[in-house]
């Protein structure tokens, strides 16, 4: 045996000289090498570099380096290569997570849903319904719900209130002198005060990343249509400043689109599990009426999924 189980000083190991039977204390070899010749009464131990395909992580007294793990099976990629100092380490590529020994695509949160928790190489994305005052108009595995454009803050009118799937549509304000109220034929864009924002069902899917709270979704590419979840499309806020009861329904598993969306880095937010997220502040420059307010890319440094 190259190493005895007896105590030895740090940085040394015990070796029994096979010819004399004498127990010798030898210096260990550094990480990335192994003991090609043990020490004797007359000589120091000899270290050699680990051959290709093998490694040692720590200083040691072993006579042979450890074999590296097998090459990463598709679609995994190497996080660390097999080298003298490190074993090969495989991880799922960006946009995928490890599930049952293989890689599955991150759930894509559907329109009307945003990312509540971003995915990692070991955990799927968690989706949530966009809450009052927020929306998501593209399927994405990285974007949070974004706040509706603040039309009033830009001195514009809400021509069409946003929903959880669409932004507010802003238009030029119509100014009338106090002495000349608008005639009955003039169109002014009023803001209904009590429209249920998500009460008009449309699609009924739930993204996979919304399974039980403490569950990690295990799935391969999913495109499933969960049961019983309505994706309402009624206005979520009457105006930026006076919103209606928007909904932030959190579908347990919004449908997933299996393709990955380019990170649009738009913000979303969640409050109670769903609506308190994201802080995307945005502004849209609508000059002509009507114009859809485009949230500007958040100036937030991190594109934390939960953020954008």
């Amino acid at each position: 045996q190259p190493e005895q189980k007896t105590l030895s000083l740090p940085g040394t190991y015990r070796h029994v000289d096979r010819t004399t039977g004498q127990v010798l204390t030898c210096d260990k070899c550094p990480a990335g090498t192994y003991v090609s010749e043990h020490c004797t009464n007359m000589s120091l131990r000899v270290c050699s570099s680990c051959p290709a395909g093998t490694f040692t992580r720590h200083e040691n007294g072993i006579e042979r380096c450890h074999d590296c793990s097998q090459p990463c099976p598709w679609p995994m990629i190497e996080r660390l290569p097999c080298a003298a100092l490190t074993d090969r380490e495989c991880i799922c590529p960006p946009g995928m997570y490890q599930s049952n020994g293989t890689c599955a695509p991150h759930t894509v949160c559907p329109v009307g849903w945003g990312v509540r928790k971003k995915g990692t190489e070991n955990e799927d994305v968690r989706c949530k319904q966009c809450a009052r005052g927020t929306f998501s108009d593209v399927p994405s595995s990285v974007m949070k719900c974004k706040a509706h454009t603040d039309c009033l803050g830009q001195n514009l009118e809400v021509v069409k209130p946003g929903t959880k799937e669409t932004d507010n549509v802003c238009g030029m304000r119509l100014f009338f002198s106090s002495t000349n109220p608008p005639s009955s034929g003039t169109v002014t864009f009023s803001h209904p005060e009590h429209m249920e924002s998500h009460d008009v069902p449309s699609s009924t899917y739930e993204p996979q990343g919304m399974n039980s709270t403490d569950s990690n979704s295990t799935a391969s590419v999913r495109t499933k249509v969960p049961s019983g979840i309505e994706e309402g499309t009624v206005p979520d806020n009457t105006s930026s400043t006076s919103g209606k009861e928007g909904t932030n329904r959190t579908l347990p598993n919004p449908p997933q689109v299996t393709h990955q969306q380019a990170p649009h880095h738009r913000h979303i937010l969640k409050l109670l599990p769903s609506s308190m997220e994201a802080t995307g502040e945005k502004s849209s420059t609508a000059i002509k009426a009507p114009k859809r307010g485009h949230p500007r890319q958040n100036a937030h440094k991190h594109f934390d999924i939960n953020e954008h």
Partner: antibody, heavy 115, light 110 residues
Framework: EVQLLESGGGLVQPGGSLRLSCAAS????????MSWVRQAPGKGLEWVSS????????LYADSVKGRFTISRDNSKNTLYLQMNSLRAEDTAVYYC????????WGQGTLVTVSS | QSELTQPPSASGTPGQWVTISCSGS????????VYWYQQLPGTAPKLLIY???QRPSGVPDRFSGSKSGTSASLAISGLRSEDEADYYC???????????FGGGTKVTVL
């Protein structure tokens, strides 16, 4: 008009159980995430639990995890909170709230845990 | 101890401007929207501000919200006696994976 009406509160001994209900009306209940938030006497608001519109995902505060269970019956427009192994520190007014933004709240129901 | 820090109290005379702060961290306010709730004595909380600075219909424009970095604030201009209440800020916390509330601020109209 959106209305949330909690019920089921009362006096219970430590270790006991209680089931709170929240009857919703005035909106499409099945479209909304719902939550329970509590307020101990003279204290601030504390989020307790939330459930997605279909019931597929639930979230719990660490202080109640493993003891409380949130559920909903969309056919009855009702939200529930099953509270087991109750402790004195669970004494509070329990509110149900609508949407992730908690845009509407019920009037609350008082739960007193005392021997 | 709350993840969001609010001053326990604030006060002002009628007509004055009062500001309530809410301090958090990158994992909550810094990365998520802020909500404010008003709780009048003996009543349930009511949503006052959502997504940092938006008011639900029916909320007077005397109330305004703002957010900067990891802090948020609620301003009440033209303070009125009916504004005497407890005010709470709230947001989502990415690290806790849960919503969090501030400890609340009691506003007194002198």
């Amino acid at each position: 008009e959106v209305q949330l009406l909690e019920s089921g509160g009362g006096l219970v001994q430590p270790g006991g159980s209680l089931r709170l209900s929240c009857a919703a009306s005035g909106f499409t209940f099945s479209n909304y995430e719902m939550s329970w938030v509590r307020q101990a006497p003279g204290k601030g608001l504390e989020w307790v639990s939330s459930i997605y519109s279909s019931g597929g995902e639930t979230l719990y505060a660490d202080s109640v995890k493993g003891r409380f269970t949130i559920s909903r019956d969309n056919s009855k427009n009702t939200l529930y909170l099953q509270m087991n192994s109750l402790r004195a520190e669970d004494t509070a007014v329990y509110y149900c709230a609508r949407d992730g933004a908690a845009d509407y709240w019920g009037q609350g129901t008082l739960v007193t845990v005392s021997s | 101890q709350s993840e969001l820090t609010q001053p326990p109290s604030a006060s002002g005379t009628p007509g004055q401007w009062v500001t309530i702060s809410c301090s958090g961290s990158t994992s909550n306010i810094g990365n998520n929207y802020v909500y404010w709730y008003q709780q009048l004595p003996g009543t349930a909380p009511k949503l006052l501000i959502y997504t940092n600075n938006q008011r639900p219909s029916g909320v007077p424009d005397r109330f305004s919200g703002s957010k900067s970095g990891t802090s948020a604030s609620l301003a009440i201009s033209g303070l009125r006696s009916e504004d005497e209440a407890d005010y709470y800020c709230a947001t989502w916390d990415d690290s806790l994976y849960a919503p969090v509330f501030g400890g609340g601020t009691k506003v007194t109209v002198l």
